[in-house]
């Protein structure tokens, strides 16, 4: 959690911003609230990225005022209007590219303050796993396959049965480019599986950790998927 | 008890469709389980053609793959095999069975012999 | 695919006496899985998960092996045993069967 104060004359006024990961070639939202005002008049919102000479977003007088705004951010930004009054200054971020990580500020100006805080951006892809049995195998065999990563991930097996077991010897990973050639695709095999188990295939780089989940019985098959962002300090 | 009970048309001219049908009663082919279709030769020589899982999925024997489909009714609990082009070398004893995963064949329907004339 | 290959292809022996058919398999497998069939009838599960007799086969029978061998093994051929014994995989894809053993008596 990044908490900012203002500085100068005009009191100063709290502002939070949270950091947070973006996929690339998908939208992402940079965390942005602060103390609200009355007046949606009274406000000013505006988003730097350090480095960038231009601004990234402003939004002021209950309107975006995009004439001083960065190239590289034309038709890509927008805040949640409705909301500014209520004291969410966040930022939508339209196709997110790699080259859009980095310290973003959060500036706002109101009737009782200023105040700003800063957000680290990381741009990266991640997706939802799948685990289901590789019905082209020559052995009981279980397919882990995962989209879209970068930058490259590592991949850890595991079992409910087998706690603590190195799958490494029988598990087979590799990484596909994708068509963009940034991203690419996970597949990861897992030999030897054993009926009336759970195995869990987690894929981790510095931005995400998923996990794709299947309980094999001998009746059934029931799988399950979860993805979490990591280093998502509050600041 | 679980039964798996086959029928079909007993006769088909070669170059035809094929359409046979397992009735299961005992156990829902919703509820788990993978549902497949095995066939035997006049040579004895047993081949497994394919199955539909509980969750709908399928699976085909290779060497079947673009001639047969494998399909469920799941409100009377019946799953069915079809097969494009059959040629007298299709003439067999075609049994449905419940397969566990990676394992066994548990339970067997008796069997409908197809002949197929030309 | 896996190939199972069964030997032998016939057995003819005396009442009483032991059995033993085998069945081998191209690539290395997880459980071998067996059944019986008598004429006019659809197979019976006899041995599954490689050791464990089905319900309703006597304790005579018994099944063993790991890897690419596996066998079946009557203690005492009774003339009720008189069938074809096929082994079969469902671990790799395409499932398949061995071509049987025909159990004879002499």
């Known amino acids: 959690l990044i908490i900012g104060f203002g500085i100068s004359g005009r009191h100063s006024i709290t502002v939070t911003t949270v950091a947070s990961a973006g996929n690339i070639g998908e939208d992402g939202i940079l965390s942005c609230t602060f103390e609200p005002d009355i007046k949606l008049s009274d406000i000013v919102i505006q988003w730097l990225k350090e480095g960038v000479l231009g601004l990234v977003h402003e939004f002021k007088e209950g309107k975006d005022e995009l004439s001083e705004q960065d190239e590289m951010f034309r038709g890509r930004t927008a805040v949640f209007a409705d909301q500014v009054i209520v004291g969410n200054a966040s930022l939508r971020l339209k196709n997110v590219q790699l080259t859009d990580a980095g310290t973003y500020k959060c500036y706002i100006i109101t009737s009782k303050g200023k105040g700003n805080a800063n957000l680290e951006y990381k741009t990266g892809a991640f997706s939802m796993p799948e685990v289901n049995v590789d019905y082209n195998a020559s052995s009981e065999t279980l397919r882990c396959e995962a989209p879209r990563w970068f930058p490259q991930p590592t991949v850890v097996w595991a079992s409910q049965v087998d706690q603590g077991a190195n799958f490494s010897e029988v598990s087979n990973t590799s990484f596909e480019l994708n068509s963009e050639n940034v991203t690419m695709k996970v597949v990861s095999v897992l030999y030897n599986v054993t009926i009336n188990n759970t195995y869990s295939c987690m894929i981790e780089n510095d931005i995400a950790k998923a996990t794709g989940d299947i309980k094999v019985t001998e009746s059934e098959i029931k799988r399950r998927s979860h993805l979490q962002l990591l280093n998502s300090k509050a600041s | 008890d679980v039964l798996l009970q086959e029928s079909g048309p007993g006769l088909v001219k070669a170059s035809q469709s094929l359409s046979l049908t397992c009735s299961v009663t005992?156990?829902?082919?919703?509820?788990?389980?993978?549902w497949n279709w095995i066939r035997q030769f006049p040579g004895n020589k047993l081949e497994w053609m394919g199955y539909?899982?509980?969750?709908?999925?399928?699976s085909y024997n290779p060497s079947l793959k673009n001639r047969i489909s494998i399909t469920r009714d799941t409100s009377k609990n019946q799953f069915f095999l079809r097969m494009k082009s059959v040629t007298a070398e299709d003439t067999a004893t075609y049994y449905c069975?419940?397969?566990?995963?990676?394992?066994?064949?548990?339970?067997w329907g008796q069997g409908t012999t197809l002949t197929v004339s030309s | 695919e896996i190939v199972l290959t069964q030997s032998p292809a016939i057995m003819s022996v005396y009442l009483g006496e032991k059995v033993t058919m085998t069945c081998s398999a191209s690539?290395?497998?997880?459980?071998m899985h067996w059944y019986q069939q008598k004429s006019s009838t659809s197979p019976k599960l006899w041995i599954y998960?490689?050791?464990k007799v089905a319900s309703g086969v006597p304790g005579r029978f018994s099944g063993s092996g790991s890897g690419n061998s596996y066998s079946l093994t009557i203690s005492s051929m009774e003339a009720e045993d008189v069938a074809t014994y096929y082994c079969?995989?469902?671990?790799?894809?395409?499932?398949?069967f061995g071509s049987g053993t025909k159990l004879e008596i002499k």
């Open positions: 069975a419940r397969k566990a995963l990676w394992l066994r064949f548990d339970y």
């Open positions: 005992g156990y829902s082919i919703t509820s788990g389980y993978f």
């Open positions: 539909i899982s509980y969750d709908g999925g399928n």
């Open positions: 690539l290395s497998v997880s459980y």
């Open positions: 998960d490689t050791s």
């Open positions: 079969f995989q469902g671990s790799g894809y395409p499932f398949t």
